[in-house]
Amino acid sequence: SDKLYQRKEPVISSVHTKVKGIAEVTENVTEGGVTKLGHSIFDTADYTFPLQGNSFFVMTNYVKSEGQVQTLCPEYPRRGAQCSSDRRCKKGWMDPQSKGIQTGRCVPYDKTRKTCEVSAWCPTEEEKEAPRPALLRSAENFTVLIKNNIHFPGHNYTTRNILPTMNGSCTFHKTWDPQCSIFRLGDIFQEAGENFTEVAVQGGIMGIEIYWDCNLDSWSHHCRPRYSFRRLDDKNTDESFVPGYNFRYAKYYKENNVEKRTLIKAFGIRFDILVFGTGGKF
């Protein structure tokens, strides 16, 4: 409630997060022309990436382009990229949609299609749909610990969301445990009215709002956070220009003294932690 006699001050905040959980991933692996089921374990180091600011990212799906080498090759025959003669290919041209620099030659991509030869990481990335269901759909059961320290410098008051009395094995629940700072990712989505399994395919952005409404007067002192959740990206994926949330990264290695890389297009959820509120004191 608004106490007009109080001097109000906006919150200054710092956030630190820790994600925990293990995912078992089953996917088709092709070796020597033979496709078989491959099983792999993903731990925190495999699916989380350090982000700047009050954000963390959890990979929920991916598309791999394995064994890429820097050389010449035909570019992927995306729409409008096919050619029938060298005239269509311009030496030195860097098409923003392409993955390399054209050599000026039109070469066979496969039995039926020709594309411009490019200097690039080869074979160039194919335009594949994100796997459905998501490969790391079990990320729904991962948990995140959010440490939030806040400060009101004008009132010389500092506190944090984690209290010494808190149980490390608790899980946030809006009704039963609203002060627990360990959140199950699936619960965050449920609270926001979203389907984790669906969002995990293409990725998305989820907001975790921490609201501090602090009464710092000694006779009626109260300063505890209130958590709420809402989706921040455009969820109408059919209508949005670039649906979901994804980025690419590479793992580099050497094979027979040749530098190679595995390109990974990672889809996942970026969680943005938004801390706001005021501290009031007479």
Epitope: G67, Q68, V69, T71, L72, C73, P74, T103, R105, V107, P108, Y109, D110, K111, E117, C122, P123, N256, V258, K260
Partner: nanobody, 120 residues
Framework: EVQLVESGGGLVQSGGSLRLSCAGS??????IGWFRQAPGKEREEVSC????????YYTNSVKGRFTMSRDNAENTVYLQMNSLKPEDTAVYSC???????????????RGQGTQVTVSS
């Protein structure tokens, strides 16, 4: 139909030479690789050629002894093998792929192979 046919194999004494041919039909290729497989061993990439610029790659064990060339008009590539050693004995085949250049066999052409035997 996409096809590759090898020829030129045979029996030769150590230090001798052979010239293998790989003729393509039914498609225009971009990269051709020569591979060999000795009994009880894995398939090994010997060399590759890129048709557009004629650049070649050779595995270390054949460098300086084998030469790959192409005849675009004839749709044929050649593997000139000199100073042959008994360890070069294998079935040699060509394919529209090159592992060294990360070029997968999207065209799907692969020959049946030709036997090369080097006696000591």
């Amino acid at each position: 139909e996409v096809q590759l046919v090898e020829s030129g194999g045979g029996l030769v004494q150590s230090g001798g030479s052979l010239r293998l041919s790989c003729a393509g039909s039914g498609f225009s290729y971009y990269i051709i690789g020569w591979f060999r497989q000795a009994p009880g061993k894995e398939r090994e990439e010997v060399s590759c050629i890129r048709v557009t610029d004629g650049s070649t790659y050779y595995t270390n064990s054949v460098k300086g002894r084998f030469t790959m060339s192409r005849d675009n008009a004839e749709n044929t590539v050649y593997l000139q093998m000199n100073s042959l050693k008994p360890e070069d004995t294998a079935v040699y085949s060509c394919a529209t792929e090159c592992q060294r250049w990360a070029y997968p066999n999207r065209i799907g052409a692969r020959g049946q192979g030709t036997q090369v035997t080097v006696s000591s």
